[in-house]
Interface confidence: medium
């Protein structure tokens, strides 16, 4: 079975690598534009130069192309805590990241938010904070893990999952409650 190709891919596959087929004349292969540039005019004929122009400020192309326009530079999302790691150049998009001692939580494939790494107070660090993952904490006795923070077992209600981890404390609380009702 032949994989389905889009029109542009079909046209490009006729030409050797680094060239694309002229949109008005499929017997001509034009040289693609270098990264950092975009297609201003197709080559007029075989062996003649493609008219490529450099991307304007605020735009880029990161690979060889025959795009009619450069791509707009991404903006780091301040409301997501993102900071600019490197500015946009004509051949590279803005690189956004997080501050030191923060990690990225990806709400979706292309959007992340920065959060502070957990310090594991009342516990120990099981796995250190990574670029895309919070610290994994192990809690000391008398504490249970909630929202990746070690919380005192005195805050454990019977309905929560912490009951197994805080069983002795829960029983003590239950005993106190029972004695109060008799």
């Amino acid at each position: 079975l032949v994989p389905h190709l889009g029109d542009r891919e079909k046209r490009d596959s006729v030409c050797p690598q680094g060239k694309y087929i002229h949109p008005q004349n499929n017997s001509i292969c034009c040289t693609k534009c270098h990264k950092g540039t975009y297609l201003y005019n197709d080559c007029p004929g075989p062996g003649q130069d493609t008219d490529c122009r450099e991307c304007e400020s605020g735009s880029f192309t990161a690979s060889e192309n025959h795009l009619r326009h450069c791509l707009s530079c991404s903006k780091c999302r301040k409301e997501m805590g993102q900071v600019e790691i490197s500015s946009c150049t004509v051949d590279r998009d803005t690189v956004c990241g997080c501050r030191k001692n923060q990690y990225r939580h990806y709400w979706s494939e292309n959007l992340f938010q920065c959060f502070n790494c957990s310090l594991c107070l009342n516990g120990t660090v099981h796995l250190s904070c990574q670029e895309k993952q919070n610290t994994v904490c192990t809690c000391h006795a008398g504490f249970f893990l909630r929202e990746n923070e070690c919380v005192s077992c005195s805050n454990c209600k019977k309905s929560l999952e912490c009951t197994k981890l805080c069983l002795p404390q829960i029983e003590n609380v239950k005993g106190t409650e029972d004695s109060g009702t008799t």
């Epitope: 999302r77 709400w107 979706s108 292309n110 959007l111 929202e147």
Partner: nanobody, 119 residues
Amino acid sequence: EVQLLESGGGLVQPGGSLRLSCAASGFTFSRENMHWVRQAPGKGLEWVSGIGPRGMPTYYADSVKGRFTISRDNSKNTLYLQMNSLRAEDTAVYYCAKGMNSHDGFDYWGQGTLVTVSS
């Protein structure tokens, strides 16, 4: 048609509590990240809290951590924000938002509900 309808706002004294609700329709609620965002008078938007499709994970802005709790009931297509120990600086219009799937931000917003914290 996607609809997000917030309710539960009002006037409350400092230290008081409120529970906001957001009724969702027109999309598969149980598949979406959901968020609360707020806008204080004369200020920009501030992300408050977010929750994963199945109720986990939950995330909070530092300014509300330990005071606010986000939750959802997928059987009722409803998002909640329990706000305790309210402060004057929590005064804002609170919006429920769906998605956040691109560089452009949230897919859809509600019309907002006003929370006023004042004595």
